[in-house]
Interface confidence: low
């Protein structure tokens, strides 16, 4: 017997569907109507045939009352080839729901997204996470998707993007966006970052994550942020292979005074990089290759400095973080 594709937990909180059959019974997903957190994985299926069975242009207001009754707040859709028209139809219906967080992963979006009809209402998401999503429309995908969202988006995460640079002239500002995560785009690089950080389109960013994005120096990142007018409070540059030295011909970059937390862990650093902000609340240099204790004049003024897992403290050992239990367990670097 084949296992049930959908499983709802005992608290009716989380429902996970794995549709791996060539002709899945999509009606099985109805058991998820009572769940707050829903995950639907489509096993790599092409959802093109769906367009024949649904009227993507139908007025979604006819479903408004039903959709409003759904408890779903977090929805993950993964592993499918989705026509843009179908995605738009789903977004139009979900606009009447109480959905707050949407994650799309391992999707191939085919075709172009039509513009938002005048009478249509956007989806009031607080968080949108995309991982390994490809769009037929290339660089204009964010602008096309953005018009289907209300302007209150607070968290945007884009990982393994096929086109992490955006068509900036088409993108509208994200006035409420406080967290932007472009991590796990190893081909991005500092020039790509400049292209992705559309100037003045991210005025409210407080947290910027750039883990594993091909960044080379903190100074190069500083220049990209300055060019875009982005002034994060917290910047994560961990898991990049960073150079400690600055190109002498490169102009000095003044970090924004708003920046108070900088993560440079797992960056392969053999010394504290030059060109750091003069003052920080938090600096994480853990799991690097520092062979000696940094001298005070090499460091910014910092209230909380983490140096766990560097060779000068002894190879392979680490120290507890502030607030962590000193259990003797060594975090692996």
């Amino acid at each position: 017997t084949t296992p049930e594709p959908c499983e709802l937990d005992d608290e009716d909180f989380r429902c996970v569907c794995n549709f791996s059959e060539p002709q899945p019974d999509w009606s099985e997903a109805f058991q998820c109507v009572s769940a707050v957190e829903v995950e639907i994985h489509a096993g790599g299926l092409n959802l093109e045939p769906f367009l024949k069975r649904v009227d993507a242009d139908a007025d979604p207001r006819q479903y408004a009352d039903t959709v409003k009754a759904l408890r779903v707040r977090r929805l993950t859709v993964g592993a499918a080839q989705v026509p843009a028209q179908l995605l738009v139809g789903a977004l139009r219906v979900l606009a009447y729901s109480r959905l707050k967080e949407l994650t799309l992963e391992d999707l191939k979006i085919t075709g172009t997204m039509p513009p938002l009809p005048l009478e249509a209402t956007g989806l009031a998401l607080s968080s949108l996470r995309l991982r390994n999503v490809s769009w037929a429309t290339g660089r204009s995908w964010l602008a096309e998707l953005q018009q289907w969202l209300k302007p209150g988006l607070k968290v945007l995460s884009i990982a393994q993007a096929h086109s992490p640079a955006f068509s900036c002239e088409q993108v509208r500002a994200f006035p409420a966006l406080t967290s932007l995560d472009l991590s796990d785009n190893p081909g991005l690089g500092e020039r790509g970052l400049m292209a992705a950080l559309c100037p003045h389109k991210f005025p409210a960013i407080q947290n910027l994550a750039l883990r594993n994005t091909g960044m080379e120096t903190p100074t190069g990142v500083c220049a990209a942020l300055a060019a875009a007018g982005v002034q994060p409070h917290s910047l994560d540059l961990s898991h990049n292979s960073l150079r400690a030295t600055v190109n002498p011909s490169a102009p000095r970059c003044m970090w924004s005074s708003a920046l108070n937390s900088l993560n440079l862990s797992f960056a392969g650093l053999e010394q504290v990089p030059k060109g750091l902000p003069a003052k920080l609340r938090v600096l994480d240099l853990s799991c690097n290759r520092l062979n000696r204790a940094p001298q005070p004049d090499e460091l910014p003024e910092v209230d909380n400095l983490t140096l766990d897992g560097n060779p000068f403290l002894v190879p392979g050992t680490a120290l507890p973080h502030e607030g962590s239990m000193n259990s003797g367990v060594v975090p692996a670097c």
């Epitope: 003052k279 000696r292 204790a293 940094p294 001298q295 005070p296 460091l299 003024e301 910092v302 209230d303 909380n304 400095l305 983490t306 140096l307 000068f312 403290l313 120290l319 507890p320 973080h321 502030e322 000193n326």
Partner: nanobody, 118 residues
């Protein structure tokens, strides 16, 4: 939050030895110095010995050649090996962590009594 806990104090005859230990919990910063101070009743605390994260040591003139400060590799524990103890070494010994970051901060243990008498 940093916490320091001393152990190893006690009574010993002149010429004897004691080993004090100070266990630290909380983070270690590159600019930290850990040390031992002592204070007799009514006196100011005076530095006995200190050690930095990088391993640099400092001693009071009165204990040079008799006392040795050391640490484990993670600086979770700092030791003070006291040899050839003298009656004038009798004091309460306090573990100290000095952190020079944006501002200089001192953290103290509660102290351990060392008594040298014949």
């Amino acid at each position: 939050q940093v916490q320091l806990q001393e152990s190893g104090g006690g009574s010993v005859q002149p010429g004897g030895s004691l080993r004090l230990s100070c266990s630290r919990s909380g983070p270690i910063y590159s600019v930290d110095t850990m040390g031992w101070y002592r204070r007799a009743p009514g006196e100011q605390r005076e530095l006995v010995a200190s050690i930095t994260v990088g391993g640099t040591t400092t001693y009071a003139d009165s204990v040079k050649g008799r006392f040795t400060i050391s640490r484990d590799n993670t600086m979770n524990t700092v030791y003070l090996q006291m040899n050839n103890l003298k009656i004038e070494d009798t004091d309460v010994y306090y573990c100290n962590l000095n952190r020079r970051l944006a501002k200089s901060e001192d953290y103290w243990g509660r102290g351990t009594q060392v008594t040298v008498s014949s």
